[in-house]
């Protein structure tokens, strides 16, 4: 029977700016049950406040509701790791919410073939962008990544869309079903997880872009 | 012709773990995203999560954090679903499901019980 | 996460009669939305995807519309093998949810 191995705080994100969650890993637990706490002051003050919320982001976390997230402030954080022979201590690690923002997916992808009479055809798609993002207070910009493939390719094609809501895609083969996704990140952050795949049948008579 | 086949059923006791394995032909798993989505007795379907074997990443709902865990190995086209700390509940059909939902496999009856 | 509400739980028709199943969802999900038939001891089966495209190998008599919030999933004339349990599924954001299904029985 030993005291616990020390832990490591490996993730903190945050979805808007509003509120964030951390993770840490245990160490080895020494043989015995072990308890841990999360503690942070914000850099300038020597107060300390413990985790207000263990339980929100699942095990091994600390979720900072709106009350305790503040954009303009560095936290600084550690968890400690107790059991009946002793503790142990992660290392420091200093959060700036502006820098870990992780969006939610995008939403709403729609993707259609568009057959115009006197062009080429096309598969045209948009998107909405996470709920949880206010892009009117101008504290964001979305950047955004689509990617496609037939159903049965191993290898993605992916395009840069910029800030825009909307692509187009020209080169795309005949009679195949295609999957979409979408994805997101702010421009000082972190690229969200892909959207569900939208899939759609590309007719057999499309014509290929020359 | 693309077939989803699962491993044969299990009963476990509570607390414990089970793997359940969904083994992919007809197609690579590489090229394959699964969902698993369970269905307890006489009760509706509930998607649990989704893995991509291409970049490893693994989404899933809420009330499963920190008791579900995906993978996949692609050089057997297999995907694999674990469920721990295992509760009555628990009892269900598990299906793994193509990305496009029109593969599913056969489903795995998971009994859970002292 | 998005809450999908099925009705009615029951529909009892007869054979050769139209089937008119509902399903809305509690937030837009456009037209990322599945409909899933099952029987009983087998795994469901995909009739719709894309609120309105009919998956390989399902009969015309399965057609779907609606876009947002609303879909309706309509069998034009019911067989004999068409009475099942019928899911719809969005698949527009995490996590993706079901519907809590409708029964349609012989009448």
């Known amino acids: 029977q030993l005291p616990p191995g020390k832990p490591e705080i490996f993730k903190c994100r945050s979805p808007n700016k509003e509120t964030f969650t951390c993770w840490w890993r245990p160490g080895t637990d020494g043989g015995l049950p072990t308890n841990y706490s999360l503690t942070y002051h914000r850099e300038g003050e020597t107060l300390m406040h413990e985790c207000p919320d263990y339980i929100t982001g699942g095990p091994n976390s600390c979720h900072f509701g709106k009350q305790y997230t503040s954009m303009w402030r560095t936290y600084v954080m550690m968890v400690n790791a107790t059991n009946q022979m002793g503790s142990s201590f992660s290392d420091e690690l200093y959060v700036d919410v502006t820098y870990i923002v992780q969006p939610d997916p995008p939403l709403e992808l729609t993707v259609e073939v568009k057959q115009p009479e006197d062009r080429k055809p096309y598969l045209w798609m948009k998107w909405s962008p996470p709920t949880l993002i206010d892009l009117k207070t101008g504290w964001f910009t979305l950047l955004y990544e689509i990617r496609l493939k037939p159903e049965k390719a191993a290898e993605w094609e992916t395009h840069f869309a910029g800030q825009q809501t909307e692509f187009k895609i020209l080169s795309l083969h005949p009679g195949q079903k295609y999957l979409v996704q979408v994805r997101c990140k702010p421009d000082h952050g972190y690229w969200s997880a892909w959207s569900p795949a939208t899939f759609i049948q590309i007719p057999s008579d499309f014509i290929m872009n020359d | 012709q693309v077939q989803l086949v699962q491993s044969g059923a299990e009963v476990q006791k509570p607390g414990a773990s089970v793997k359940v394995s969904c083994k992919v032909s007809?197609?690579?798993?590489?090229?394959?995203?699964i969902h698993w989505v369970r269905q307890a007795p006489g009760k509706g379907l509930e998607w649990m999560g989704n893995?991509?074997?291409?970049?490893?990443?693994?989404i899933h709902a809420q009330k499963f954090q920190g008791r579900v865990t995906m993978t996949g190995d692609t050089s057997t086209d297999t995907a694999y679903m674990e469920l721990s700390s295992l509760r009555s509940e628990d009892t269900a059909v598990y299906y793994c499901v193509g990305v496009t939902f029109d593969y599913w496999g056969q489903g795995t009856l998971v009994t859970v019980s002292s | 996460e998005i809450v999908m509400t099925q009705s009615p739980a029951t529909l009892s028709v007869s054979p050769g009669e139209r089937a008119t199943l509902s399903c809305r969802a509690s937030?837009?999900?456009?037209?990322?939305l599945a409909w899933y038939q099952q029987k009983p001891g087998q795994a469901p089966r995909l009739l719709l995807y894309?609120?309105?495209t009919r998956a390989t190998g399902i009969p015309a008599r399965f057609s779907g519309s609606g876009s947002g919030t609303e879909f309706t999933l309509t069998i034009s004339s019911l067989q004999s093998e068409d009475f099942a349990l019928y899911y719809c599924?969005?698949?527009?954001?995490?996590?993706?949810?079901f519907g809590g299904g409708t029964k349609v029985e012989i009448k």
């Open positions: 894309g609120a309105s």
């Open positions: 007809g197609y690579t798993l590489t090229a394959l995203s």
């Open positions: 893995f991509d074997p291409g970049d490893g990443e693994t």
């Open positions: 937030q837009s999900v456009a037209s990322n």
């Open positions: 599924q969005h698949y527009n954001n995490w996590p993706l949810t």
